[in-house]
């Protein structure tokens, strides 16, 4: 190889050890029967060296070097050439590095052609392997730009006072050209400018200068975003940290277009904008900070760009002005992440302040939109608390469990409409009373229905949960002991269409002691499934549960449980089940923890079935599953 | 299981020649440069020279220049170091090693007296 | 050639002790390597490429050092760490090695 560097090119040429492939043994630079690990060559002379290796490229990285000084004398703008051409050097990783210095007075600006450049973070790294590093200059200190990557929407980069380029070639790369050219411009009286240009949908993320460490102290930096109209853009920001401020605050500050409040002041802890309409400027600006704690402020952040939705210009009223203890959120429905580009999917409040979720509370009307390409990404989560604390106001009082109108008409998918309904310990209870009866979800017969209610207490401590009910069933009414939640949660988006079938009452009553107790009145056609609350977890401790079941004059029930033995083990005390004619008061007791369950018995009148819990052994669970059959009385049982 | 074998101890007149064989077993020869390098006695180490295996390029401190010849075998894993011209002043331990950028294998070392 | 000087020559410490060994190169080098040597025995590798250790040394030990300023460092010696310890270079030949480094107890 020869290299030779015309004088006066202000060109320096380092051939040094990169990162050694360790199983290898060493490869030298040979020139006259010397060999050395590093060559130095510069500007006006003549090398010819070998290298001791077949493969250097293994071994050696090379570094060119150009000096440009606009500080004396005219600046060298226009496209930048590879200097020396790569044909020329050795095929070994390169790095060609541009170190521009000129006055704090002039503005300098990389132009990059097509392809853009996209900013990559800490540990990333470019799939071609070919890398931008950029860096400015505060007086003697470095500020790095970023390192950047092919194919992005990054068209400019304006600094001043010197800017350091290093492009990064691996040895098998056939680029020759630098692919961004150097031009003059007036102080941008700030650390930098990054243009961002967006040709149609896509996304970019961006980082505060020196990211992952701390931006400048008390200085400005701009990004401009270049949107076509008809797109519409939103600000996410992904990462950020504040420093510790003595004078002024750290803020950025947008630049919209057709605002009337321009620029728009923002905290970096605040909803950053979305749904803007066409190109837009953001400027992050530091502060003075505590010289004994300064902190750092950083801050990564992304802007997706997107088609406006048929959506996104429609508003709707959310009114809540009526409502007590209510929340509304409406957020992503989990979903796996795909590699390739989706587009962003948000709410947005007053059609300006849009994030993925959004949550809105009782006591106001609110006015929101969606940004979003398929509304089925989204769901809503609505909870609701219904509490009494004076039992002599509340007892025998009603309320309706409906789901409001006005939610019914978003036109995004209700996940859950949890009610939470409270009452004084001890003093009352409550009584759930479907319009339509329900049946208990159970393996044996599962709801179909595009809703269910499900039912569990609200006592922190207890862990009960009372089973998912769906219209179409048997049970009339729960009775529960205490604090529960009823969480009516949809399965189809067909919910819209049954939302009709749904509605529950429920009444606060005079206290008593069982934990539940279900009203059945079966119907002559099917067979009627009921399980133990907190199915495959078993019955809490001493809990007692009780079933009203309800056989009509011309009828006879058949009660049939479905495995021989209850399976408890007792640690303390008795689990037992009482089986009692309500007619004639006569009953049967079973000790679930010894005997067997009982056969299949018929009853011609309505009974009750009352299971209670013991304190069972851990693994050994009180799980009982039981049908009730109605069958006319003309027909001959035996 | 890596090893560098040299040949036994050697005594030697003034003016004649020695040559020390280092032969290597649970590696490749090709794959690293063969060094000699000599501790005279009580004294520190003091590089002489090496070969490639590879393409039996050869490399000399300039002090030795002249006077060492460095070979080696490829056939038989054996490199071998030939100083001539000897002098009281060359009685040393001569230790061979495989060098790579990770590995260093040494030979047990063969003493060389020169003596009259 | 690159000289390389190792500092000091002899290092008089009690077990316990943390030990630092310099080694200065008349001009720039890109890696270097230590070596241990004990009375009668062949030198044993002990750092390569600067700062790794090679295969069995303890971990109280550790490399540092670019350009012609390098160090080995003992965090705590071991009765088992008192011996010569030697640099070399392997950026230009001749590959000199340094006078070497005895530590020894006091």
């Known amino acids: 190889f020869e290299i030779a560097l015309p004088r006066e090119s202000n060109i320096t040429v380092l051939i040094k050890l990169g990162t050694p492939t360790l199983l290898a043994k060493p490869c030298y630079i040979v020139i006259s029967k010397r060999h050395i690990t590093m060559l130095s060559i510069k500007s006006g002379e003549r090398i010819v060296f070998t290298f001791s290796c077949q493969s250097p490229e293994n071994h050696f990285v090379i570094e060119i070097q150009k000096n440009i000084d606009c500080m004396s004398g005219p600046c060298p703008f226009g496209e930048v050439q590879l200097q020396p051409s790569t044909s020329l050097l050795p095929t070994l990783n390169r790095t060609f590095i541009w170190d521009v210095k000129a006055h704090k007075s002039i503005g300098l600006e990389l132009q990059f052609s097509i392809p853009r450049l996209r900013q990559i973070g800490p540990g990333e790294s470019c799939p071609d392997g070919v890398t931008h590093s950029i860096s400015g200059r505060i007086d003697a200190t470095v500020v790095r730009i970023g390192t950047f990557c092919s194919n992005g929407t990054v068209s400019r980069i304006k600094m001043q006072e010197g800017v350091k380029m290093a492009l990064h070639l691996p040895w098998f790369h056939p680029r020759n050209v630098s692919g961004f050219s150097i031009a003059n411009r007036s102080s941008i009286k700030r650390l930098c400018i990054i243009e961002s240009v967006f040709e149609g949908e896509g996304s970019a993320t961006l980082m505060s200068a020196n990211y992952p460490e701390g931006f400048p102290e008390d200085e400005l930096m701009t990004w401009q975003f270049v949107v076509p109209a008809h797109l519409r853009a939103s600000v996410s920001f992904l990462n950020f940290n504040l420093s510790n401020c003595e004078r002024k605050e750290e803020r950025v500050e947008y630049y919209i277009p057709g605002s009337t409040t321009n620029p728009e002041v923002f905290k970096l802890e605040d909803k950053q904008p979305g749904n803007m309409a066409g190109n837009f400027n953001l400027s992050l600006q530091g502060c003075d900070q505590d010289a004994q704690s300064p902190g750092i402020l950083r801050l990564q952040f992304q802007v997706l760009v997107q088609h406006p939705q048929n959506e996104s210009n429609k508003i709707y009223v959310v009114d809540l002005s009526n409502e007590r203890a209510m929340s509304l959120t409406i957020e992503p429905r989990p979903v796996k992440q795909s590699r390739k580009f989706v587009p962003g999917c948000f709410v947005c409040l007053e059609s300006r302040t849009c994030s993925s979720n959004l949550t809105l509370t009782s006591g106001s009307k609110h006015k929101i939109s969606f940004l979003c390409d398929d509304l089925t990404r989204l769901w809503m989560n609505v909870e609701k608390t219904i509490s009494c604390t004076d039992h002599r106001y509340c007892q025998r009082k009603s309320y309706s469990l409906q789901v409001p109108s006005d939610i019914l008409h978003l036109p995004v998918e209700l996940h859950d409409f949890s009610w939470k309904l409270l009452v004084p310990k001890d003093r009352l209870s409550l009584v759930l009373v479907p319009a339509q009866k329900l049946q208990q979800h159970t393996h044996e017969k599962p709801c179909n229905t595009s809703f269910s209610y499900l039912v569990a207490s609200a006592i922190p401590s207890q862990d009960l949960y009372f089973g998912s009910f769906c219209p179409g069933g048997s049970i009339k009414q729960i009775q529960v002991k205490q604090n529960i939640s009823v969480t009516l949660r949809t399965f189809a988006p067909s919910f819209q269409q049954e939302a009709s079938r749904q509605g529950l009452t429920v009444s606060f009553i005079p206290y008593f002691k069982e934990e539940g107790v279900f009203t059945v009145t079966p119907d002559t056609k099917s067979k009627v499934y009921l399980r133990t609350p907190n199915w495959d977890r078993g019955l809490p401790s001493l809990t007692s549960v009780s079933w009203n079941i309800s056989v009509p004059r011309d009828q006879v029930a058949c009660l049939t449980f479905f495995k021989e033995r209850s399976g408890v083990v007792c640690q303390t005390g008795r689990a037992f089940m009482i089986i009692q004619e309500q007619r004639t008061r006569a009953e049967e007791i079973f000790s679930l923890d010894e005997d067997v369950l009982p056969k299949p018995s018929f009853h011609h009148h309505s009974f009750w079935v009352n299971i209670s819990n013991c304190s069972p052994t851990s693994g050994k669970q009180l799980d009982l599953l039981f049908s009730v059959t109605l069958t006319p009385r003309t027909v001959d049982l035996t | 299981q890596v090893q560098l074998v040299q040949s036994g101890a050697e005594v030697k007149k003034p003016g004649s020649s020695v040559k020390v064989s280092c032969k290597a077993s649970?590696?490749?020869?090709?794959?690293?440069?063969m060094n000699w390098v000599r501790q005279a006695p009580g004294q520190g180490l003091e590089w002489i020279g090496w070969i490639d295996p590879e393409n039996a390029n050869t490399i000399y401190d300039p002090k030795f220049q002249g006077r060492v010849t460095i070979t080696a075998d490829e056939s038989t894993s054996t490199a071998y170091m030939e100083l001539s011209s000897l002098r009281s002043e060359d009685t040393a331990v001569y230790y061979c090693?495989?060098?790579?950028?990770?590995?260093?294998?040494w030979g047990q070392g063969t003493l060389v007296t020169v003596s009259s | 050639e690159i000289v390389l000087t190792q500092s000091p020559a002899t290092l008089s410490l009690s077990p316990g002790e943390r030990a630092t060994l310099s080694c200065s190169a008349s001009s720039s080098v890109s890696y270097l390597y230590w070596y241990q040597q004990k009375p009668g025995q062949a030198p044993r590798p002990w750092i390569y490429?600067?700062?790794n250790l090679a295969s069995g040394v303890p971990a109280r030990f550790s490399g540092s050092g670019s350009g012609t300023d390098f160090t080995l460092t003992i965090s705590s010696l071991e009765p088992e760490d008192f011996a010569v310890y030697y640099c070399?270079?392997?950026?230009?030949?001749?590959?000199?090695f340094g006078g070497g480094t005895k530590v020894e107890i006091k």
């Open positions: 649970g590696f490749n020869i090709k794959d690293y440069y």
């Open positions: 070399q270079q392997w950026s230009s030949n001749p590959f000199t």
């Open positions: 490429l600067t700062s």
């Open positions: 090693y495989g060098s790579s950028y990770r590995f260093t294998y």
